[in-house]
């Protein structure tokens, strides 16, 4: 058993039917010695008397808010949450596995640049009685500071019969140098509590591996005289690290017909312009990627050919 | 990915082309190592990230773009003191810091070259003959060093009398390639920045 926060405790249980459970001793936070009784949640049934209460915790019915009283007055509370260990693996019932880029990916994180700012998000089908708390650091043995905001509900979507809820959090490394070569990963820890169930999720990554630039901006077409060709031009996104000659991007330019089945023409360039043939009803899209370290491509920025 | 390869203009900063080749070569070698050593801990998540140049060179600090020198987090250890002149500085008014930067890059390359050659000698003794260093990568390191053209003491190749542990050597190869790839990215960024300056 360990303390999650004041008066909130997590009991770690080997979780299988008929498992022996854990014996827990609760102590009433009071100088009083006599006439103390204990109750659980809203029930008035007295579970025991005395300054300490010993309980065998085996299932969720044994968890909840234990209260010690004296003569009708509440002395203190202890909320017991359960953390299930199924066959030696901590349970992951609260969050959905996003399965990208691999199984058991519960947290996904992205950074728009090398400033040390990043966003993480996760999914759940649970809509009520749910709280999250997020901590982060650079490295784990001698952790360096990363400050995270509060997790917020950022999207809701319907998936088949279920509603899916997306939560996200923004974090910022306290003293980040964009040019630094990372040797210690960023660690992100999310505590999730649903009713009386506690779970924790972690992700470990280097900022360089989660870079996903914003799409190129100011995408423009300039028709070339006496030709079906156009000059496409664009700019680095505002959110990208500077100077751009050091933090260079490479670009992919795509000409896509109206029909998804039509052949796509693609050109790769390090410049911020390209000459392409603009077909009728086609659209031109450009996306960006770090020129030197192949992390994710940005989303496409698009303009119609007409 | 199949990006078109840029061919440098004759007047272009002479080292840019070599640094691009270096990054391509080390990335290919790392990919080959990951595939060949699939049952070894060779991915970025599995390895310890060690930098063999730590406390010996300070390329990141010495080569920091001017725009980032205002960022205090980037200025924690700028006390290296290499100074010399190399051919990459040809016909340019170069600052002390630029000379320091290129000299630091040269020292990095020299250290990695020694490590890779020592490791290759061990890998050639492996009866499994599972993986060897790409000669192209070693050649590209050499070419960039020559382009930098710094006068420096030659570091003798390490030789070991004990029987090599091939498992450990292959894991060390992965660690070294990951670190060298990160340094090659920095070198490429620096050369691109200097070329634009």
């Amino acid at each position: 058993i360990w303390e999650l926060k004041k008066d909130v405790y997590v009991v770690e249980l080997d979780w299988y039917p008929d498992a022996p459970g854990e014996m827990v001793v609760l102590t009433c936070d009071t100088p009083e010695e006599d006439g103390i009784t204990w109750t659980l949640d809203q029930s008035s049934e007295v579970l025991g008397s005395g300054k300490t209460l010993t309980i065998q915790v085996k299932e969720f019915g044994d968890a909840g808010q234990y209260t010690c009283h004296k003569g009708g007055e509440v002395l203190s509370h202890s909320l017991l949450l359960l953390h299930k260990k199924e066959d030696g693996i901590w349970s992951t019932d609260i969050l959905k596995d996003q399965k990208e880029p691999k199984n058991k990916t519960f947290l996904r994180c992205e950074a728009k640049n090398y400033s040390g700012r990043f966003t993480c998000w996760w999914l759940t089908t649970i809509s009520t009685d749910l709280t999250f708390s997020v901590k982060s650091s650079r490295g784990s043995s001698d952790p360096q500071g990363v400050t995270c905001g509060a997790a917020t509900l950022s999207a809701e979507r319907v998936r088949g019969d279920n509603k899916e809820y997306e939560y996200s959090v923004e974090c910022q490394e306290d003293s980040a140098c964009p040019a630094a070569e990372e040797s210690l990963p960023i660690e992100v820890m999310v505590d999730a509590v649903h009713k009386l169930k506690y779970e924790n999720y972690t992700s470990s990554f280097f900022i360089r591996d989660i870079i996903k630039p914003d799409p190129p901006k100011n995408l423009q077409l300039k028709p070339l005289k006496n030709s079906r060709q156009v000059e496409v031009s664009w700019e680095y996104p505002d959110t990208w690290s500077t100077p751009h000659s050091y933090f260079s991007l490479t670009f992919c330019v795509q000409v896509q017909g109206k029909s998804k089945r039509e052949k796509k023409d693609r050109v790769f360039t390090d410049k911020t312009s390209a000459t392409v043939i603009c077909r009728k009803n086609a659209s031109i899209s450009v996306r960006a990627q770090d020129r030197y370290y192949s992390s994710s491509w940005s989303e496409w920025a698009s303009v119609p050919c007409s | 990915r199949n990006l078109p390869v840029a061919t440098p203009d004759p007047g272009m900063f002479p080292c840019l082309h070599h640094s691009q080749n270096l990054l391509r070569a080390v990335s290919n070698m790392l990919q080959k190592a990951r595939q060949t050593l699939e049952f070894y801990p060779c991915t970025s998540e599995e390895i310890d990230h060690e930098d063999i140049t730590k406390d010996k060179t300070s390329t990141v600090e010495a080569c920091l773009p001017l725009e980032l020198t205002k960022n205090e987090s980037c200025l924690n250890s700028r006390e290296t003191s290499f100074i010399t002149n190399g051919s990459c500085l040809a016909s340019r008014k170069t600052s002390f810091m630029m000379a320091l930067c290129l000299s630091s890059i040269y020292e990095d390359l020299k250290m990695y070259q020694v490590e890779f050659k020592t490791m290759n000698a061990k890998l050639l003794m492996d009866p499994k003959r599972q993986i060897f260093l790409d000669q192209n990568m070693l050649a590209v390191i050499d070419e960039l060093m020559q382009a930098l053209n710094f006068n420096s003491e030659t570091v003798p190749q390490k030789s070991s009398l004990e029987e090599p542990d091939f498992y450990k050597t292959k894991i060390k190869l992965c660690i070294l390639l990951h670190a060298f790839r990160i340094r090659a990215v920095t070198i490429d960024r620096v050369m691109s920045y200097l070329n634009a300056s």
Epitope: D87, I89, S91, I94 | F39
Partner: antibody, heavy 112, light 107 residues
């Protein structure tokens, strides 16, 4: 007493469908993840798929992905395995399990 | 996918013998390994989880050990009811995979 009882097995033609059920009792079913495991005649054990408590996470073996669907109805203390596009190689005894408890198994035969 | 290679595939032993079955994972699986016992025409029985933890009710003569890639199930003194087929399983990553089984027969 903890019990897991499978049902719904039988003979089916290739390409056909079958729905297996597993009735659980003796424990708080909704609080536990469940698995399906199968065993072809004379062969070893093969994991088919798993479902977490609350159905938030469901995983399948590559051999059945896209053809089999695992679901649960906590109000009925029941686990299900919907099997579509059955192949002869799906012939096996199917067990539902929640360590350390296993059902007795139900036999599925896919044959023309 | 992680392969679990069990050895031997079969062995003959006498009552009272100490029996050791090994299982090798193709990749590091930590301690996320379970062992099962199965008798002909019966459902498997769970013995060990987390490489070395016995489920309640499993006799103490069964013990498991190992971590990473090498795991062992030991029966310290073979009893008549222990003649069966034993399977190891990794549950470190999906898909979950079983070893091919070890048949323990009477000598």
């Amino acid at each position: 007493e903890v019990q897991l009882v499978e049902s719904g097995g039988g003979l089916v033609q290739p390409g056909g469908s079958l729905r297996l059920s597993c009735a659980a009792s003796g424990f708080t079913f909704s609080d536990y993840g469940m698995v399906w495991v199968r065993q072809a005649p004379g062969k070893g054990l093969e994991w088919v798929g798993s479902i977490s408590s609350g159905s938030s996470n469901i995983y399948y073996a590559d051999t059945v992905k896209g053809r089999f669907t695992i679901s649960r109805d906590d109000s009925k203390n029941s686990l299900y395995l919907q099997m579509n596009s059955l192949k002869t190689e799906d012939t096996a005894v199917y067990y539902c399990a929640r360590n350390p408890y296993w059902g007795q198994g139900t036999t599925v035969t896919v044959s023309s | 996918d992680i392969q679990m290679t069990q050895s031997p595939s079969s062995l003959s032993a006498s009552v009272g013998d100490r029996v050791t079955i090994t299982c090798k994972a193709s990749q590091n699986v930590g301690t996320n390994v379970a062992w099962y016992q199965q008798k002909p025409e019966k459902a498997p029985k769970s013995l060990i989880y987390s490489a070395s933890h016995r489920y309640s009710g499993v006799p103490s003569r069964f013990s498991g050990s190992g971590s990473g890639t090498d795991f062992t199930l030991t029966i310290s003194s073979l009893q008549p009811e222990d003649f069966a087929t034993y399977y190891c399983q990794q549950y470190n990553s999906y898909p979950l995979t079983f070893g091919g089984g070890t048949k323990v027969e009477i000598k």
